[in-house]
Each structure stands twice: as C-alpha cells, then as structure tokens.
C-alpha cells in the first residue's frame, strides 16, 4: 500500500527532513508550509494550524519560497542618471543599471557602486567581446584583410573590399581603395555594430585591459600601474 501523504503541519519522522517548500518550525516542532514568492508569513504555524501567508505590501517583495515575517523593501528609486531595467514587484527587487554606454565596474549589495564608460576601440581595433551591464568591451587588433576606421565601443573589424585593381592597399585602420569604377565585391556601406549591452544583475566583473580610448578600468585590479595595452590611446 502507498504511504499516506502527510498534510502540513506534521511531525517529521526522526532523522528525516521536511519536504520541498516546507520548513521545520522549531517552536511547533512541525513541518509547515513556506509562503510563495510575493508573500510572507503573517501567522506562524502551530501543532494544529499551518502557516498563514499574506501578500507583500507595495514597494516590498520576496523572491523565494520563505517564512519571513516581513517582506523585504525594494531598493530606492533609480536616480535620474540610471536606467530601471527591472521594476519593483511583489516578487522581485528593482534593478537599476548604468546609463547606455556605461557599465557597472564595481557593485554593492543594493546595486552598482561605480559606473564606468565602456571602452572604445580605436581605429585598427575592433570589438572582440561587447560590453554588458557588468563587463567592459574587449578590443582586438584587426586581422590581416580586415579593418576598423572608427573609435567605437560597438564596431567590429570588417573585411577590406576586393578590388580589380588596387589603388591603395587596405590596412588595419583603412579600407582598400580601388582604381576601377567598382570593386568586384564590397561590403555594405557603414560600420557594423554589435548590439548594445543586455541587462544583467549587477555583479563585479574584473575587466580585461585592452586597447581603447576610454580609460582602462584596470584600476579595479589589486596591482600597481602597468603600461597601457598596445594600441591604447587613453591619457
């Protein structure tokens, strides 16, 4: 015969633990129900009655199954120079992120401590890894046959156009110049852009020093000053 399903509250078997979404109440010495995300424990369980849950009030939340007496307060409103990427709801805290073109270089419990500008790759270098909300752009030198003629945190290296007759060969920072009226194959005009950073929860990410025009944020690393990376044009 199948074992009888116990309904909360119930006394656990000696040596066993409570089931998923239940907790052991020390006072009642019973397994009791947790409250779902967006709720909190209004009345704790007894030997004869289960936990009574209630919804979180405005500007408060619980993200996990819980038995807390009060919901957590949402963080303060995002300042005018931050972007709210996640609103405060009963089930999640507000998340404020850095303005476009900046990323969180140092984080703290309540969000970001220091926003820093995303590195810009100078001509001859393209974006190898785009920036995110919590990590800087990584630049790389343009490989032979490719170029970037912009100072940008989003442009990648693009192939040189192929000419019937080359007037000026391309290099890492300049496209090839053709003598004929049109090249045999050319890329679509305009720079290639990588997508802007997607929102992620703030966390500390050590940036990788790379060629750039934006200041290197290697100041976050626990070491003394080092020479700028090759191709860097920062002050």
């Amino acid at each position: 015969l199948p074992a009888q399903v116990a309904f909360t509250p119930y006394a656990p078997e000696p040596g066993s633990t409570c089931r998923l979404r239940e907790y052991y109440d020390q006072t009642a010495q019973m397994c009791c129900s947790k409250c779902s995300p967006g709720q909190h424990a209004k009345v704790f369980c007894t030997k004869t009655s289960d936990t009574v849950c209630d919804s979180c009030e405005d500007s408060t939340y619980t993200q996990l199954w819980n038995w807390v007496p009060e919901c957590l307060s949402c963080g303060s409103r995002c300042s005018s120079d931050q972007v709210e990427t996640q609103a405060c709801t009963r089930e999640q805290n507000r998340i404020c992120t850095c303005r476009p073109g900046w990323y969180c270089a140092l984080s703290k419990q309540e969000g970001c401590r220091l926003c820093a500008p995303l590195r810009k790759c100078r001509p001859g270098f393209g974006v190898a890894r785009p920036g995110t909300e919590t990590s800087d752009v990584v630049c790389k030198p343009c490989a032979p046959g490719t170029f970037s003629n912009t100072t940008s945190s989003t442009d990648i290296c693009r192939p040189h156009q192929i000419c019937n007759v080359v007037a000026i060969p391309g290099n890492a920072s300049m496209d090839a110049v053709c003598t004929s009226t049109s090249p045999t194959r050319s890329m679509a005009p305009g720079a290639v852009h990588l997508p802007q950073p997607v929102s992620t929860r703030s966390q500390h990410t050590q940036p990788t020093p790379e060629p750039s025009t934006a200041p290197s944020t290697s100041f976050l690393l626990p070491m003394g000053p080092s020479p700028p990376a090759e191709g860097s044009t920062g002050d």
């Epitope: 120079d81 401590r113 002050d235």
Partner: antibody, heavy 119, light 107 residues
Framework: QVQLLQSGPELVKPGASVKLSCKAS????????INWVKQRPGQGLEWVGW????????KYNEKFKGKAILTVDTSSNTAYMNLHSLTSEDSAVYFC????????????WGTGTTVTVSS | DIVMTQSHKFMSTSVGDRVSITCKAS??????VAWYQQKPGQSPKLLIY???TRHTGVPDRFTGSGSGTDYTLTISSVQAEDLARYYC?????????FGQGTKVEIK
C-alpha cells in the same frame, strides 16, 4: 539630514603625521563611498582617494599613495585620513565628500579641516 | 589623467548680468561633468551634473551645457549671493579631476 562633520584645525610640525576625521550622520554609513579632496590655499581641488565603509575597499590618486591612508570605523560612522611625513606642500583644507549614485560627482561635502604644517 | 582647464581665473560682472564660465577637458568625457560653487570659507556645493542637470534646490538661473571636451556653466542673471569660485569636475575616469576654478567677482 545627511551631514559630514569634520574634526578641527591642525597645526603640525614638518615630518609629523596627522589623523583627520569625518563623522557621518543622517544616512546608512556603510552604503556609500567616502572620498577625500584636498584644497591648497588659493588653488583648485584635488581628489585624494575613496574608501567604501562596508568592506574597507580603497582607491588612491597615484599622487597621494604613501602620503594618505584612508580608514573607517563603522561602529562610530566615522571615516579617517592619516597624512604622513608632512611638508609645507601638505598645508591645505581637506574635505570629505559623499556621492549618492554610481557616478562620481559629490552631492554632500564635509565641513573641511585646515591642516597647517609649520615648524 | 584627464586635465580640466578653466581658462579664466577671475570673471568680473555686475548684478543682473549674464556670465559664462568655460571648462575644457583634455579628452572627450561624454558629458560626465559636474559643476560646484564654493563661497568664501565654505565647502563646495554641487550645482550641475551630467553637464546640464541641475541638482536639487539649485536656482534655474544656473544652467550647464556642453559635450565632448567643451563645457560651460552660465549664470543668466547674476545675483550678489553668486559671488563665489566655480569648479568643473570630470567623473569619466579615475582619478577624478577638477578645474582650477573661476572666481566670479561682483563689480
């Protein structure tokens, strides 16, 4: 309201050290970095460094490494700056300052402490 | 380090006049510029951030403008209480740096 109250003026001899204090009130002390800024008589402002009270993380302007040491006492909501091997160049008003957000402009300034180095 | 240059150490003006204080950064600072007012014997006070956003409680006669490397603080109608030194600051990269200050004097 948010306030940063700094210690009184200091007259010190060349080669000596001095410890300046900055007592915070009206906000959660451990949640915001405290910065220190130097102002020499008739001159501009120079950023010395920051300290994050929650974990003691510090960052110094290269120019002040070895000259200034920043510390905090979270039990008294006080930030400190130790200045070492003082010379006449260190005679200045020193301000502590706080920022609200993750961009580093300073919206709350301390009252300032005048340090005079003289024999 | 980014150098912030305030070309005028002093500016003499009359009550009611318009005055513009300039600040030039040694590199593009993406409007990460703040302006402070420091009256004699007092601590600096934040006026403007992000080049043009007025801080809470700052009178609307103070306006900031600029982008790239060139920034301006304008007082549209100078009042006697505006006698002070004004500093620009960049918060684009560490170390944070300030201009040398421009002292506004009332004729």
């Amino acid at each position: 309201q948010v306030q940063l109250l700094q210690s009184g003026p200091e007259l010190v001899k060349p080669g000596a050290s001095v410890k300046l204090s900055c007592k915070a009130s009206g906000y959660s002390f451990t949640s915001y970095d405290i910065n220190w800024v130097k102002q020499r008589p008739g001159q501009g402002l120079e950023w010395v460094g920051w300290i994050y009270p929650r974990d003691g993380d510090t960052k110094y302007n290269e120019k002040f490494k070895g000259k200034a040491i920043l510390t905090v006492d979270t039990s008294s909501n006080t930030a400190y700056m130790n200045l070492h091997s003082l010379t006449s160049e260190d005679s200045a008003v020193y301000f502590c300052a706080r920022l609200t957000g993750p961009y580093w402009y300073f919206d709350v300034w301390g009252t300032g402490t005048t340090v005079t180095v003289s024999s | 380090d980014i150098v912030m240059t305030q070309s005028h150490k002093f500016m003499s003006t009359s009550v009611g006049d318009r005055v513009s204080i300039t600040c030039k950064a040694s590199q593009d600072v993406d409007t990460a510029v703040a302006w402070y007012q420091q009256k004699p014997g007092q601590s600096p006070k934040l006026l403007i951030y992000w080049a043009s956003t007025r801080h809470t409680g700052v009178p609307d006669r103070f306006t900031g403008s600029g982008s790239g490397t060139d920034y301006t603080l304008t007082i549209s109608s100078v009042q006697a209480e505006d006698l002070a030194r004004y500093y620009c600051q960049q918060y684009y990269s560490v170390p944070w740096t300030f201009g040398q200050g421009t002292k506004v004097e009332i004729k």
